[in-house]
Amino acid sequence: TSCHDPGDVEHSRRLISSPKFPVGATVQYICDQGFVLMGSSILTCHDRQAGSPKWSDRAPKCLL
């Protein structure tokens, strides 16, 4: 009933809507100053008809 922790992203901080990542939880990654986010800044935990819940996207990267 929950997603796994999507992990930290180097050179960023993250804002978590709920500590245990239940379905509907979001994680937002914000890159440190001077770094550019590549990928999806907001991940949402989704339920699935088959299988365990999964994040809507992969964690992004923060690049110089």
Partner: antibody, heavy 121, light 109 residues
């Protein structure tokens, strides 16, 4: 139903910038999904160029990162491709496409009809 | 980059028979229990059409004669029985690792 439509210049001169617009109807580009640009070269090779996420963040093919920009106009429900310093190798049909989510191991479920851009002096 | 090698490059199949198209990624496209491999059909003058996502899931509205299988570094698109309207070029596509890449295509005649 969601529909995507590309519009582009048709002909661009080498060293100039190429700009293509994707107009989306039937779905807000700020609601969900990633909104992608894919091109198909003469000879039919397909290349994913990059996307703009519904949140506004972007992801680019590293081979193009130095000269690509994908932006959007949320008021018009459009997203844009700009490719700088083009050469004849950038001649291709340019498609915009909407993704599925990663949790569905997604593919590109909706495509525009494509716009041919020729780079020539 | 993950290179997707499709074979054969072209394929002639009689109506009603089976067509099998192979796609072999240069490294695994599996992640967290799913295979991030998709298949498209493209006809001249049209954009690619999604047939199969996540290796084996049939996209809505696609006939059941299309099926996908495989995992890791070995995937197959099967069409059975082949119909006249299936004449097209078929592409595999991985979305497991940046940059997302496509196979070179297989032309079904």
């Amino acid at each position: 139903d969601v529909q995507l439509q590309e519009s582009g210049p048709g002909l661009v001169k080498p060293s100039q910038s190429l700009s293509v617009t994707c107009t989306v109807t039937g779905y807000s580009i700020t609601s969900s999904y990633t909104w992608n640009w894919i091109r198909q070269f003469p000879g039919n090779k397909l290349e994913w160029m990059g996307y703009i996420h519904y949140s506004g963040s972007t992801n680019y093919n590293p081979s193009l990162r130095s000269r690509i920009s994908i932006t959007r106009d949320t008021s018009k429900n459009q997203f844009f491709l700009q490719l700088n310093s083009v050469t004849t190798e950038d001649t291709a049909t340019y498609y915009c496409a909407r993704s599925r989510y990663y949790y569905d191991a997604y593919g590109f479920a909706y495509w525009g009809q494509g716009t041919l851009v020729t780079v020539s002096a | 980059d993950i290179v997707l090698t499709q074979s054969p490059a072209s394929l002639a199949v009689s109506l009603g028979q089976r067509a099998a198209i192979s796609c072999k990624p240069s490294q695994s496209v599996d992640y967290d229990g799913d295979s991030y491999m998709n298949w498209y059909q493209q006809k001249p003058g049209q954009p690619p059409k999604l047939l199969i996502y996540a290796a084996s899931n049939l996209e809505s509205g696609i006939p059941a004669r299309f099926s996908g299988s495989g995992s890791g570094t070995d995937f197959t698109l099967n069409i059975h029985p082949v119909e006249e309207e299936d004449a097209a070029t078929y592409y595999c596509h991985q979305i497991n690792d940046d940059p997302w890449t496509f196979g070179g295509g297989t032309k079904l005649k």
